[in-house]
């Protein structure tokens, strides 16, 4: 049995340009201790989209639902979507360390952008 699952329930999300996109992610536990980060793409060239404690992400807002009893919500909303935002977004759990160690990624959510 897995100690931690990172769940991205939507395989894809389609949003009109200028609107906001909600990317959902839950984790079954806070343990192991460490942050959840959001990336677009995979590999060394992936782009950091949101980190709870580091960096400035003016278009990204955490939209967690704290009432969820059986898991932790790490969903985000990205505002003012443009075609350049299209891609696959991953919710990634890290174990705290020096540096933090990547443990598990969600399956990814593909964001497509429709014309206005």
């Amino acid at each position: 049995e897995e100690e931690l699952q990172v769940i991205q329930p939507e395989k894809s999300v389609s949003v009109a340009a200028g609107e906001s996109a909600t990317l959902n992610c839950t984790a079954t536990s806070l343990i192991p201790v460490g942050p959840i980060q959001w990336f677009r793409g995979v590999g060394p060239g992936r782009e950091l989209i949101y980190h709870q404690k580091e960096g400035h992400f003016p278009r990204v807002t955490p939209v967690s639902d704290p009432t969820k009893r059986n898991n932790m919500d790490f969903s985000i909303r990205i505002s003012n979507i443009t075609p350049a935002d299209a891609g696959t977004y991953y919710c990634v759990k890290f174990r705290k360390g020096s540096p933090d160690v990547e443990l598990k990624s969600g399956a990814g959510t593909e964001l497509s952008v429709r014309a206005k």
Epitope: E1, E2, E3, L4, T28, S29, L30, I31, P32, V33, G34, P35, I36, Q52, T61, P62, V63, S64, P66, T67, R69, N70, N71, M72, D73, F74, S75, I76, R95, K96
Partner: antibody, heavy 118, light 112 residues
Framework: EVQLVESGGGLVKPGGSLRLSCAAS????????MSWVRQTPGKGLEWVAT????????YYPSSVKGRFTLSRDNAKNSLYLQMNSLRAEDTAVYYC???????????WGQGTTVTVSS | DIVLTQSPASLAVSLGERATISCRAS??????????MHWYQQKPGQPPKLLIY???NLESGVPDRFSGSGSRTDFTLTINPLQAEDVATYYC??????????FGGGTKVEIK
């Protein structure tokens, strides 16, 4: 009904060792993060140790790190706290607590008393 | 360490009136918009019991006269109306991703 039953407390001399156990029933033990929290007489609560559901990850505050070791046996629905090099300040009631998400302590046992005195 | 300061240390309230307990954290306990602050009730000779999880969510089976509010560093537990069986000590607890997890010093609630 969730039940957590602690055992193994007692009187021990400074520098001695004790092993506390917590027997769990009424829930899927292997899915839960488990912890120990202690309460000193007339004082407040102090987190002592936490272990992940599968036993891979353990966490301790600096006050017990290197002296206490937390383990679990999911086949036996049991949690264990090995306490070595005990000090007078470790005297407390020790509670076993379960947490589905590793966030709040959802259920608590009745506690077992540890007294460290010469 | 994140220090949790509860106030007042003790509180005497008339039956049927409102009891309000404060918990202030030395730094934010919020992650992704969720406040990892929880409240417990402990009666003499008993273990603590979870009342409120993640700042404002009532644990199953807990009467709705208990409520929690707050975010980041400032949190409140409210009992309204206070009943005789609510005489107990109440603790706040933070479980953010900054170890160690810590508890407040407790607030003893009595009947005036």
């Amino acid at each position: 009904e969730v039940q957590l039953v602690e055992s193994g407390g007692g009187l021990v001399k400074p520098g001695g060792s004790l092993r506390l156990s917590c027997a769990a029933s009424g829930f899927t033990f292997s899915s839960y993060v488990m912890s120990w929290v202690r309460q000193t007489p007339g004082k407040g609560l102090e987190w002592v140790a936490t272990i992940s559901s599968g036993g891979t990850y353990t966490y301790y505050p600096s006050s017990v790190k290197g002296r206490f070791t937390l383990s679990r046996d999911n086949a036996k629905n049991s949690l264990y706290l090995q306490m070595n090099s005990l000090r007078a300040e470790d005297t407390a009631v020790y509670y076993c607590a379960s947490s589905l998400t590793g966030s709040s302590f959802d259920y608590w046992g009745q506690g077992t008393t540890v007294t460290v005195s010469s | 360490d994140i220090v949790l300061t509860q106030s007042p240390a003790s509180l005497a309230v008339s039956l049927g009136e409102r009891a309000t307990i404060s918990c202030r954290a030395s730094e934010s306990v919020d992650l992704y918009g969720t406040s990892f602050m929880h409240w417990y009730q402990q009666k003499p000779g008993q273990p603590p019991k979870l009342l409120i999880y993640r700042a404002s969510n009532l644990e199953s089976g807990v009467p709705d006269r208990f409520s929690g509010s707050g975010s980041r560093t400032d949190f409140t537990l409210t009992i309204n109306p206070l009943q005789a069986e609510d005489v107990a000590t109440y603790y706040c607890h933070q479980s953010s991703d900054e170890l160690p997890w810590t508890f407040g010093g407790g607030t003893k609630v009595e009947i005036k």
